[in-house]
């Protein structure tokens, strides 16, 4: 297992609709054809794999399970979007990148993006 640098923004504020997007960039030492990206959430004394995708370079990301994530790739960058977030989902979201094929296997883990989620205020009742 070889180490690899992964960069991601320090802070992102989710939209009022609970959508947060950030870029995860990795310094690929070679020409990987198969890449796995995992988003981990570290908060509330827990570590959670929020979503994971494996993709062939140049292809769409295919996320596993009932994923709340979507994403696209461009070169050594992955554009990640997490939806359906609520205030209690605020936390540190860490990008983990694995170069699966061809060998050797590389692993990189970012420092994390602190995502802040603010639940929208309910609209006041109106007489109109």
């Amino acid at each position: 297992c070889k180490a690899m640098h992964v960069a991601q923004p320090a802070v992102v504020l989710a939209s009022s609709r609970g959508i947060a997007s950030f870029v995860c960039e990795y310094a690929s030492p070679g020409k990987a054809t198969e890449v796995r990206v995992t988003v981990l959430r570290q908060a509330d004394s827990q570590v959670t794999e929020v979503c994971a995708a494996t993709y062939m370079m140049g292809n769409e990301l295919t996320f596993l399970d009932d994923s709340i994530c979507t994403g696209t790739s461009s070169g050594n960058q992955v554009n990640l979007t997490i939806q359906g977030l609520r205030a209690m989902d605020t936390g540190l979201y860490i990008c983990k990148v694995e170069l699966m094929y061809p060998p050797p296997y590389y692993l990189g883990i970012g420092n994390g993006t602190q995502i802040y989620v603010i639940d929208p205020e309910p609209c006041p009742d109106s007489d109109f």
Epitope: D65, L85, M88
Partner: nanobody, 125 residues
Framework: EVQLVESGGGLVQAGDSLRLSCAAS????????MGWFRQAPGKEREFVAA????????SYADSVYGRFTISRDNAKKMVYLQMSSLKPEDTDVYYC??????????????????WGQGTQVTVSS
């Protein structure tokens, strides 16, 4: 409806390993998020680990991260908790639970509808 039966608990020494198993019945097992929780007498039930319906995604309490591994076999309707480097503070009754709903950034807060009867794990120093 899902019925859950845990097994594999026992008395071990600190530093040892143990594997808990949870056998499920019910046709819809593969659609549930499965979790392990633990509880000591007089204390609140505590989240240990959870695994998504396909088994692709997991979640762990910080206190067990790197020491415990949760896994599942949907064909056999089984969930496992591999516990290693056990500590005296891991002593508890361990419960298997099944939760409905999509995977989320905080699976510990999902609604777990079905629970097993628990299995005792005792770690002596």
């Amino acid at each position: 409806e899902v019925q859950l039966v845990e097994s594999g608990g026992g008395l071990v020494q600190a530093g040892d390993s143990l594997r808990l198993s949870c056998a499920a019945s019910g046709r819809t097992f593969s659609s549930y998020v499965m979790g392990w929780f633990r509880q000591a007498p007089g204390k609140e039930r505590e989240f240990v680990a959870a695994i998504s319906s396909s088994g692709a995604l997991t979640s762990y309490a910080d206190s067990v991260y790197g020491r415990f591994t949760i896994s599942r076999d949907n064909a056999k309707k089984m969930v496992y908790l591999q516990m290693s480097s056990l500590k005296p503070e891991d002593t508890d009754v361990y419960y298997c639970a099944a939760g409905r709903g999509p995977w989320s950034p905080r699976p510990s807060l999902l609604t777990y509808d079905y629970w097993g009867q628990g299995t005792q794990v005792t770690v002596s120093s």
